[in-house]
Interface confidence: low
């Protein structure tokens, strides 16, 4: 009857990048299925991923409603073939997730250099503003819209002929740097939220882009 042979989920883990947020857990089900519930700490539980045989559940739609809220999730285990109408009153085993605050904890996705333009001894480097699934007034917001000045970019640049790197920072999506005339430079950017004190304060570096390739434009 009820949940006799089901086991509770474990290793509940939030995987979140640029607010795309998935809850993962173990074990791979054998003769059981899962239902996930998510809640803000002051709200009601909402069920998602009903009776799934997966060990992950995309909760993005819930967390983007308020990325500064703190969320909890729990994963219930049911026997395979379970339907609500079976009339079982037995509590299914469940496990709670760690708490998750998207604004503080979502990982920053790898940024992309959109373009760079050289004018004399100046180069303007533009970072592509990534779109997120966070909405305001039915409009999707960019990473910059969400984080505002909390988000900065660090530019690493170096002469193609040398390994010595220089850095620049901006709290917009553009850099204006000085370069030596006649030299080719390579660029890589990293997204950073300086106010974070955890491992997720920086993104991975963008792919390297070098002058003399298609993204660049040169004007005297």
């Amino acid at each position: 009857s009820g949940t006799t042979n089901t086991v509770a989920a474990y290793n509940l883990t939030w995987k979140s990048t640029n607010f795309k947020t998935i809850l993962e857990w173990e074990p791979k089900p054998i003769n059981q299925v899962y239902t996930v519930q998510i809640s803000t700490k002051s709200g009601d539980w909402k069920s998602k991923c009903f009776y799934t045989a997966d060990t992950e559940c995309d909760l993005t739609d819930e967390i983007v409603k308020d990325v500064k809220q703190t969320y909890l999730a729990r994963v219930f285990s049911y026997p395979a073939g379970h339907v609500e109408s079976t009339g079982s009153t037995e509590e299914p085993p469940y496990e709670n997730s760690p708490e998750f605050t998207p604004y503080l904890e979502t990982n920053l996705g790898q940024p992309t250099i959109q373009s760079f333009e050289q004018v004399g001894t100046k180069v303007n480097v533009t970072v592509q503003d990534e779109w997120t699934l966070v909405r305001r007034n039915d409009t999707f917001l960019s990473l910059r819209d969400v984080f505002g000045k909390d988000l900065i970019y660090t530019l690493y640049y170096w002469k193609s002929s040398s390994s010595g790197k220089k850095t620049a920072k901006t709290n917009t999506n553009e850099f204006l740097i000085d370069v030596d005339k006649g030299e080719n430079y390579c660029f890589s950017v990293q997204a950073v939220i300086p106010s974070r004190r955890t491992a997720n304060r920086k993104s991975t570096d963008s792919p390297v882009e070098c002058m003399g390739h298609e993204k660049g434009e040169s004007r005297e």
Epitope: A8, S39, K41, E91, E95, N96, P98, E99, E105
Partner: antibody
Framework: QVQVVESGGGLVKPGGSLRLSCAAS????????MSWIRQAPGKGLEWIGI???????YYADSVKGRFTISRNTNENTVYLQMNSLRAEDTAVYYC???????????WGQGTLVTVSS | ELVMTQSPPTLSLSPGERVTLSCRAS????????LSWYQQKPGQAPRLLIY???KLATSIPARFSGSGSGTQFTLTISSLQPEDFAVYYC????????????FGQGTKVEIK
Amino acid sequence: QVQVVESGGGLVKPGGSLRLSCAASGFSISSYDMSWIRQAPGKGLEWIGIIGSNGRTYYADSVKGRFTISRNTNENTVYLQMNSLRAEDTAVYYCARGLYDGTGNIWGQGTLVTVSS
Amino acid sequence: ELVMTQSPPTLSLSPGERVTLSCRASQSVYGNNWLSWYQQKPGQAPRLLIYGASKLATSIPARFSGSGSGTQFTLTISSLQPEDFAVYYCQGTYYSGDWYFAFGQGTKVEIK
């Protein structure tokens, strides 16, 4: 074997400081919420504070500003730094894993802290 | 802040009797069910009996059961055994921008 072991208790003068340690084995503290609870002689249990699996800390009003919980995930150890100690802080101090709703709940045997001149 | 109130403070009973302990929260515990019961014997650390208001912890005998929701909770021992004489604590969880955890003052179950 999954267990937690507290250490660092002893006699300290009022106004003094003490750091308690909670060494965990058989599991990773970075995956669990770890709490400190105390029990004064002949009294009930009192929750002191918690460090979440994400490293966030919360404290009881009675110790806010005086006590600090931290952790070293490499050493798999949780700490309770106690400053400005008072006589009423005399108690057995317990470290426990998983207090949110009891799942995965494990308690140590406690360490006695005596605050007296 | 969350305050947990247990009643009665002391119960004098004989083995075999049915025991009902009460715990009241000053406001609804988180999720209406984040309420645990612990047993503590002299010189020992507390031992978890019930979590989630009604779920039996690992290796706890089935004579222990929990019920309730929101602010009112009950621990029942269907038939008191000699090893059950101890102090019982309820512990609730509350959230209001910060987490709060609070224990009741305890109910001592002693031999009559």
